[in-house]
Amino acid sequence: AGVFELQIHSFGPGPGPGAPRSPCSARLPCRLFFRVCLKPGLSEEAAESPCALGAALSARGPVYTEQPGAPAPDLPLPDGLLQVPFRDAWPGTFSFIIETWREELGDQIGGPAWSLLARVAGRRRLAAGGPWARDIQRAGAWELRFSYRARCEPPAVGTACTRLCRPRSAPSRCGPGLRPCAPLEDECEAPLVCRAGCSPEHGFCEQPGECRCLEGWTGPLCTVPVSTSSCLSPRGPSSATTGCLVPGPGPCDGNPCANGGSCSETPRSFECTCPRGFYGLRCEVSGVTCADGPCFNGGLCVGGADPDSAYICHCPPGFQGSNCEKRVDRCSLQPCRNGGLCLDLGHALRCRCRAGFAGPRCEHDLDDCAGRACANGGTCVEGGGAHRCSCALGFGGRDCRERADPCAARPCAHGGRCYAHFSGLVCACAPGYMGARCEFPVHPDGASALPAAPPGLRPGDPQRYL
């Protein structure tokens, strides 16, 4: 028997770009709490029941209100350790899930609302009685720093908390063959009752004469390491060296959902659909009935008629999820069209429309030309919700109200001189060029690249452009 202890040091934005928005605001103050779930063994597919080593919930942290404009700092944490007592031997290898939850304290109907802010998971080796192990885990843009240890509860001692200590029978020393129980030097090890030769490091017993192995060890005396598969290479194509065919990547490969949960891929990861009675990211939280009060936010718990339906939460308006743990963000219904920004105001949805669009759902493409005349013979052109006038020659500006200098763009090629004219512009071409813009060279033999000039006009004469 013993206790696994978890100390959270900090929870805040991780390094690098994309700092997360503060989870709390002046309008919606909140506080954090943590949940830890422990499973024995390193294998994620282990058949043990969920949180078989135990689970614990922290106290609520101090209330936090974001300072406007300030980046999200490390958030204030609950006091004290999270302690998970374990009754049997400490397995030496274990899997953990640490969840950071946010409790919103605004004017909630039906009390505060909880939402999962971050979840980290890992697999570790740890001997009981050792020093604190430090760890840093990242979940999205958040970073969690924590320490953990496993310690045995007297009279148990040892790396697996399987050796027992008893008070000394004599004041000065322990009995024959028995050592003092460090660090309890005034106690002695109880006589070993395991099978003779049972590995003291990798085996333990709960009944006289038996030898049970810790994760990763096998054999009658727990002295043989479990041979690992030769296919421990990362996901990818088959390895010529091992001859293993490793499946291609897929978040649902090997079904990460426990307890009969079904896995479906999402664009970012995967989602487990849990049988009723189980919940959590991987359906790892189990055995819940209405007596456990699994429905958050005032959800009504109804017991199911069969084991597949241990309970169901009927959520009050504004909440969803199998435990009513999620606030319904009606913007997830994607109600706004044409790139409009969705705002869920609680009592109503609002769409903030991009320029050129209107309507409660930004569904109307504004006819920008309606009621907007372009002056001086210009014509209105629509495009992407933006209004534009195509102006007649000699005019410019947004509404064609400005008289344009037709020569401003230097339209006459090859050194031709431009003259503004009431009907447009005239180019006086340099010798050797002709055309409305002086764009055509006159051939040396006098022939033009164009059809012959109209009667009365010689190459080099000003060409009026109408």
Epitope: T266, E271, P317, S332, L333, Q334, P335, R337, R361
Partner: antibody, heavy 117, light 107 residues
Framework: QIQLVQSGPELKKPGETVKISCKAS????????MHWVKQAPGKGLKWMGW????????GYADDFKGRFAFSLETSASTAYLQINNLKNEDTATYFC??????????WGQGTSVTVSS | DIQMTQTTSSLSASLGDRVTISCRAS??????LNWYQQKPDGTVKLLIY???RLHSGVPSRFSGSGSGTDYSLTISNLELEDIATYFC?????????FGGGTKLEIK
């Protein structure tokens, strides 16, 4: 034009799993949430929930929590409905429908699922 | 949940008639009321959204009205192709709910 085409009819035994597909075309798939509606034989329409096609996050009506899962294959503009541990009362026609901000404006033709031992 | 009630489960009318189908909500839902048509072959189409707006491609003989908790769908000049079951649906509060349907038949 806008179309939602669903997979064909399914005949299953109790306890089995079924996965229905809904392939969208004629619009940008990730701009509109996809909804699922159940119609038991001779009965009315019952809204099951939706999936946000941009994030993949689903939302389920109370009666469809647990054995039902909505998912996406965005690259194929396809939404899926999976029903696990089928029961006789899951016998129904299931529709997918696009939501335009006001209503479910385009519907699939429906997929009939029959659960019988 | 908002309950939607279509008191008339079936209705007989003659071609050319003006037909009104009603729908009542258990609570006010801000005009987020839609009407759908389900043909005998099972296909479902949106007719009217947001109480009175006609969906694109729907004939103008269909119209919707109402407010608060009472809403109605009107077909001004019944045609043979209108033989179907009509469902109302509220889209204001989750979960969305449908009326039980009104089956329209020809006399």
């Amino acid at each position: 034009q806008i179309q939602l085409v669903q997979s064909g009819p399914e005949l299953k035994k109790p306890g089995e799993t079924v996965k229905i597909s809904c392939k969208a075309s004629g619009y940008t798939f990730t701009d509109y949430s996809m909804h699922w509606v159940k119609q038991a034989p001779g009965k009315g329409l019952k809204w099951m929930g939706w999936i946000n096609t941009e994030t993949g996050e689903p939302g389920y009506a109370d009666d469809f929590k647990g054995r039902f899962a909505f998912s996406l294959e965005t690259s194929a503009s396809t939404a899926y409905l999976q029903i696990n541990n089928l029961k006789n009362e899951d016998t129904a026609t299931y529709f997918c429908a696009r939501y335009d901000g006001y209503a479910m404006d385009y519907w699939g033709q429906g997929t009939s699922v029959t659960v019988s031992s | 949940d908002i309950q939607m009630t279509q008191t008339t489960s079936s209705l007989s009318a003659s071609l050319g008639d003006r037909v009104t189908i009603s729908c009542r909500a258990s609570q006010d839902h801000s005009n987020h009321l839609n009407w759908y048509q389900q043909k005998p072959d099972g296909t479902v189409k949106l007719l009217i959204y947001y109480t009175s707006r006609l969906h694109s491609g729907v004939p103008s003989r269909f119209s919707g009205s109402g407010s608060g908790t009472d809403y109605s769908l009107t077909i001004s000049n019944l045609e043979l192709e209108d033989i179907a079951t009509y469902f109302c649906q509220q889209g204001d509060m989750l979960p969305w709910t449908f009326g039980g349907g009104t089956k329209l038949e020809i006399k």
